[in-house]
């Protein structure tokens, strides 16, 4: 058993049939020695009395908010949770393995530019009594200060008969320079209770690893005079890392005919601008990568070919 | 046909070129690494992540930005007389250039090629002959190295007496290559900056 | 393995047009990005146009934008080069090369390292 945060514990039990559980002795927190009694949530059932209590906790019905009175008044609560193991394996039944970029990713995290601050999600099918609080840092042994911002719903989608819910949360490296060379991941701890079940979710990550650059902006078509000609330009994105002569981008202009069928035309550049032939009905887009650190592609920017 | 590779014109920053070269040769190489090495702990969750210029140059502080250097957590440790030597300056003089900036980039490639050729030494020696270090790579260092043209000593090739444990130097070379990759990019951003200035 | 054999280069005098072509042999343009390349006596060669695998997206080097126009024709193998209002400075070898698109270095429209080379077409431009 060990603390979650104030008043409230954790019983970590091995989830097996007929297993023995966990023994469990509970303190009544007052000065007071006689006349306490014990309650467990909302029932008046005295499940035992004195400053202390003891309980095998085997299953969900043996957790739960943990009461001592005495004459009519509450002296103190314990809440216990569960947190599951089976077959040596913690549960993860409360979250959505996303399987995006390999099975078991239940936290995806991703950054816009290199100032240290990210942004991570996770899904679930849980609407109600859930709660999660996330905590970061750099490196494990010896770890570096990030602030993470409460977690909040983002948004929601129907999956077939099924709601899903993403939650968010953005954290902020304390002191980070763009231009550091990361030795140290960054460790991410998501807790989640869900009723009386506690469950943690793990990552870590370098930043450059998780970048995603914004998609370029200002993307703009001028007809070349006396030709079927374009000029299409671009700029980086507000949120991306400054110098930009030092975090450069390299874009990857598409035309895309209104069939999908069609197939799609591209080129990579590291210019901002290109000259491209309009076709009726084409679109044009175009998406931005860290130049020297392959991560991930911006989503597109596009533009019709009218 | 090839015709020679085109050299950048002589406006342009000389270094931009040969660093572009470094990064995807190192690159390429790291990719090969992990190919070849798939039963091997080569992927960046799998190693530790070491820096063999650690303490020992400072190319990262030195080359920082002139607009990063306004952000406190960029200034460790930072010099800042200015560069006057290394043929990659051409005649440009810029608040950029510090003191170790363009020097510190040919001391790491020093460290790195005499750590690459000392490991290539190695795996030759390997029974199994299953991966060598790509001469291009050590080709590329090589020509940057020579295009910052700093004096320097030469460091002599490491020579071990004790018979070389594969496993170990395949891991150690996993480790290199990923150090080497990250500070191919930084040493890219910076002749990209430079270029730029 | 692709065989490019560069065509139409001549004697011209300023403010005329030529139109170089470029033909390949042995393999399909089609997944190639095609660029034009020039040489001057005693100057770096440098990229002036090219052309996606497509044909929708190009790139040129400032001083021939509106001038020199680049095209394929994936039908017949061959990209073009049409090139109006020339000027003594556009005097220069004249070089078809390919790179393939899908390639693991993923190279850059204006990118001077290509895969496949033609021998030239010689262009002159008399005032």
């Known amino acids: 058993i060990w603390e979650l945060k104030k008043d409230v514990y954790v019983v970590e039990l091995d989830w097996y049939p007929d297993a023995p559980g966990e023994m469990v002795v509970l303190t009544c927190d007052t000065p007071e020695e006689d006349g306490i009694t014990w309650t467990l949530d909302q029932s008046s059932e005295v499940l035992g009395s004195g400053k202390t209590l003891t309980i095998q906790v085997k299953e969900f019905g043996d957790a739960g908010q943990y009461t001592c009175h005495k004459g009519g008044e509450v002296l103190s609560h314990s809440l216990l949770l569960l947190h599951k193991k089976e077959d040596g394996i913690w549960s993860t039944d409360i979250l959505k393995d996303q399987k995006e970029p390999k099975n078991k990713t239940f936290l995806r995290c991703e950054a816009k530019n290199y100032s240290g601050r990210f942004t991570c999600w996770w899904l679930t099918t849980i609407s109600t009594d859930l709660t999660f609080s996330v905590k970061s840092s750099r490196g494990s042994s010896d770890p570096q200060g990030v602030t993470c911002g409460a977690a909040t719903l983002s948004a929601e989608r129907v999956r077939g008969d099924n709601k899903e819910y993403e939650y968010s949360v953005e954290c902020q490296e304390d002191s980070a320079c763009p231009a550091a060379e990361e030795s140290l991941p960054i460790e991410v701890m998501v807790d989640a209770v869900h009723k009386l079940k506690y469950e943690n979710y793990t990552s870590s990550f370098f930043i450059r690893d998780i970048i995603k650059p914004d998609p370029p902006k200002n993307l703009q078509l001028k007809p070349l005079k006396n030709s079927r000609q374009v000029e299409v330009s671009w700029e980086y994105p507000d949120t991306w890392s400054t110098p930009h002569s030092y975090f450069s981008l390299t874009f990857c202009v598409q035309v895309q005919g209104k069939s999908k069928r069609e197939k799609k035309d591209r080129v990579f550049t590291d210019k901002t601008s290109a000259t491209v032939i309009c076709r009726k009905n084409a679109s044009i887009s175009v998406r931005a990568q860290d130049r020297y650190y392959s991560s991930s592609w911006s989503e597109w920017a596009s533009v019709p070919c009218s | 046909r090839n015709l020679p590779v085109a050299t950048p014109d002589p406006g342009m920053f000389p270094c931009l070129h040969h660093s572009q070269n470094l990064l995807r040769a190192v690159s390429n190489m790291l990719q090969k690494a992990r190919q070849t090495l798939e039963f091997y702990p080569c992927t960046s969750e799998e190693i530790d992540h070491e820096d063999i210029t650690k303490d020992k140059t400072s190319t990262v502080e030195a080359c920082l930005p002139l607009e990063l250097t306004k952000n406190e957590s960029c200034l460790n440790s930072r010099e800042t007389s200015f560069i006057t030597n290394g043929s990659c300056l051409a005649s440009r003089k810029t608040s950029f250039m510090m003191a170790l900036c363009l020097s510190s980039i040919y001391e790491d490639l020093k460290m790195y090629q005499v750590e690459f050729k000392t490991m290539n030494a190695k795996l030759l020696m390997d029974p199994k002959r299953q991966i060598f270090l790509d001469q291009n790579m050590l080709a590329v260092i090589d020509e940057l190295m020579q295009a910052l043209n700093f004096n320097s000593e030469t460091v002599p090739q490491k020579s071990s007496l004790e018979e070389p444990d594969f496993y170990k130097t395949k891991i150690k070379l996993c480790i290199l290559l990923h150090a080497f990759r990250i500070r191919a990019v930084t040493i890219d951003r910076v002749m990209s900056y430079l270029n730029a200035s | 393995e692709v065989q490019l054999v560069e065509s139409g280069g001549g004697l011209v005098q300023a403010g005329g047009s030529l139109r170089l072509s470029c033909s390949a042999s042995?393999?399909?343009?089609?997944?190639?990005?095609v660029g034009w390349f020039r040489q001057a006596p005693g100057k770096e060669r440098e990229l002036v146009a090219a052309?996606?695998?497509?044909?929708?997206?190009?790139h040129y080097i400032d001083s021939v934008k509106g001038r020199f126009t680049i095209s394929r024709d994936n039908a017949k193998n061959t990209v073009y080069l049409q090139m109006n209002g020339l000027k003594p400075e556009d005097t220069a070898v004249y070089y078809c090369?390919?790179?393939?698109?899908?390639?693991?270095?993923?190279?850059?429209?204006?990118?001077?390292?290509?895969?496949?080379w033609g021998q030239g077409t010689q262009v002159t431009v008399s005032s």
């Open positions: 042995g393999r399909s343009l089609n997944d190639y990005i």
């Open positions: 090369a390919a790179n393939q698109l899908n390639g693991v270095a993923r190279k850059k429209i204006e990118s001077d390292d290509y895969d496949y």
């Open positions: 052309i996606s695998s497509g044909g929708y997206i190009q």
